[in-house]
Interface confidence: low
C-alpha cells in the first residue's frame, strides 16, 4: 500500500550482505525521510517478509518462515532507516531481498543480496586402517563447497580424494591422504571463500626414539609460529595409540590455563607451557608404553599434529632374569 500522491521514483541500488548460519544479520535500507512511511520487505519478489505502514507492523500476510525472525528499527524509521533486523539466518534464507519504501513524496526500491556461509571448525585426524596410515582433513558442515589443498614438505600435491556428502543445507567433507611409510610433513588447507575463512592442519612426524625399560622419555611439541597465535583460544592434547585407537594422556586448555592429566607418569613443565612449548615427559617406562604418541594443538584456525614413535626395550637386568 503506497500513498496515492505525486511521488518521485528513485532507481534501485543493490548491496551484498554476508551472513553466517544461525547468526543474526541486518539487511540495510535507507531512504530520504518523509511522512506517511510504508515499508515492504519481500524475498525473491514474491514472499512477504515484513510490512509496516500507518505507524505499525502488519504481519498478517507474512510468510510463516519469517515469523518471529524479523523486526525494523522503529525509533529510526523517521530518520530514513528501513533496515531489517533478521534473526538466525539459515541457508534457505539465501537470495534477493527487496525493500520498497514509500513516503508522501517518493518510492524507493533497495535490493539486498543475502549470501549465507557455514564453516564449522574442521579437524585433522590421524588414523590406522589395517596396515595403512591415513591423514584425514574433514569438516562436518561447510557451505559453499570449500577449496581443499594438500602440501607435502611445503610442495602442493594433486592427490586429493574428496568424500562429500551433501545435506539440504551444507556439505560434509572428508579428504583422506594415505601417508603409509612416509616421514614427510603434510599440510591441509580448507578455505571458505565466502566467509573469507581459512583453516590449516599440519602433520609432522618425529624420528623414532629407542628407550630402555624404567627410563623416561621427553617428547617435543612446539607449535609452528606461522599458525600459532597465543592470544587465540586453543587446546593441546597428548594421546597414545593402542591397538588402533588413541587414549588421551593429558590436555591443556588455554582459555582456563587448566591442565588435566590422566596418566600419573605423565608430566608437563608449567614454565615451558608459558612459553608455548608443550613438550612432555613420561617417566618409568615399561614395555607396554611402546607405540605412537600424538600431540594435537587445535584452535578455530588450525590443527597442528606432531607424532612420535617410541620403542621401549627390556633393560639388561630384565633380560638377564629371563
Amino acid at each position: 500500500i503506497f500513498p496515492l500522491a505525486f511521488f518521485i521514483y528513485v532507481p534501485m541500488n543493490e548491496q551484498i550482505v554476508i551472513g553466517r548460519l544461525d547468526e543474526d544479520i541486518i539487511l540495510p535500507s535507507s531512504f530520504e525521510r518523509g511522512s506517511e512511511v510504508v515499508i515492504h520487505w519481500k524475498y525473491q519478489d514474491s514472499y512477504k517478509v515484513h510490512s509496516y505502514y500507518k505507524g505499525s507492523d502488519h504481519l498478517e500476510s507474512q510468510d510463516p518462515r519469517y515469523a518471529n525472525r524479523t523486526s525494523l528499527f522503529y525509533n529510526e524509521i523517521q530518520n530514513g532507516n528501513a533496515s531489517l533486523f533478521f534473526r538466525r539466518v539459515s541457508l534457505l534464507d539465501e537470495g534477493i531481498y527487496t525493500c520498497y519504501v514509500g513516503t508522501a513524496i517518493q518510492v524507493i526500491t533497495n535490493k539486498v543480496v543475502l549470501k549465507v556461509g557455514v564453516f564449522l571448525t574442521p579437524v585433522m585426524k590421524y588414523e590406522k586402517r589395517n596396515t595403512n596410515s591415513f591423514l584425514i582433513c574433514s569438516v562436518l558442515s561447510v557451505y559453499p563447497r570449500p577449496i581443499i589443498t594438500w602440501k607435502m614438505d611445503n610442495t602442493p600435491i594433486s592427490e586429493n580424494n574428496m568424500e562429500e556428502t551433501g545435506s539440504l543445507d551444507s556439505f560434509s567433507i572428508n579428504s583422506p591422504l594415505n601417508i603409509t611409510g612416509s616421514n614427510s610433513s603434510y599440510e591441509c588447507t580448507i578455505e571458505n571463500s565466502l566467509l573469507k575463512q581459512t583453516w590449516t592442519g599440519r602433520w609432522t612426524m618425529k624420528d623414532g626414539l629407542h628407550k630402555m625399560q624404567s627410563e623416561h622419555v621427553s617428547l617435543s611439541c612446539q607449535p609452528v609460529n606461522d599458525y600459532f597465535s597465543p592470544n587465540q583460544d586453543f587446546k593441546v592434547t597428548w594421546s597414545r595409540m593402542k591397538s588402533g585407537t588413541f587414549s588421551v594422556l593429558a590436555y591443556y586448555l588455554s582459555s582456563s590455563q587448566n591442565t588435566i592429566i590422566n596418566e600419573s607418569r605423565f608430566s608437563w613443565n608449567k614454565e615451558l607451557i608459558n612459553q608455548s612449548d608443550f613438550s612432555m615427559n613420561l617417566m618409568d617406562l615399561n614395555l607396554s608404553d611402546s607405540g605412537e604418541y600424538l600431540c594435537n594443538i587445535s584452535s578455530d584456525e588450525y590443527t597442528l599434529l606432531t607424532i612420535h614413535t617410541v620403542h621401549v626395550e627390556p633393560s639388561q637386568e630384565t633380560a638377564s632374569h629371563n
Partner: nanobody, 115 residues
C-alpha cells in the same frame, strides 16, 4: 540502560589512518550485530560497516579494502581501523549496537580528513 561510547576520532591527513573504538555496556542481552554509520554535513546518515556476533563483517562499497571492522571476544567493544583515508570520509561516525529488542546509537565521534 544501554550506553555506547565512541573514541578515536580526530584530524588526519589524506592517506592517513585512524582507529575508532566503541565500548557498549548496560544491556541484559548480547549485542547481536554492531556497526558503524557516518553522517557528513548536509548528507544522509550512511552505513559504513557491520559485524555479527561471530565476526562476519560487511562493508559499504566506498570503504571496502580500506576499513576493517572487528570486535573483542567478549563482544562488547568494537573497532574500526580506517586506512588510506580520503577527504570524503570526513563525517561524524556513530557506533550502533543491536540486541534482540532494539538498536542503540552512540553520540558520535568526528573524523576530519584534510591537508
Amino acid at each position: 540502560d544501554v550506553q555506547l561510547q565512541e573514541s578515536g576520532g580526530g584530524l588526519v591527513q589524506p592517506g592517513g589512518s585512524l582507529r575508532l573504538s566503541c565500548a557498549a555496556s548496560g544491556s541484559r542481552f548480547s549485542f547481536n550485530v554492531m556497526g558503524w554509520h557516518r553522517q557528513a554535513p548536509g548528507k544522509q546518515r550512511e552505513l559504513v560497516a557491520l559485524i555479527s556476533s561471530g565476526g562476519t563483517a560487511n562493508y559499504a562499497d566506498s570503504v571496502k579494502g580500506r576499513f576493517t571492522i572487528s570486535r573483542d571476544n567478549a563482544g562488547n567493544t568494537m573497532y574500526l581501523q580506517m586506512n588510506t583515508l580520503k577527504p570524503e570520509d570526513t563525517a561524524v561516525y556513530y557506533c550502533t549496537a543491536t540486541t534482540p529488542v532494539g538498536q542503540y546509537w552512540g553520540q558520535g565521534t568526528q573524523v576530519t580528513v584534510s591537508s
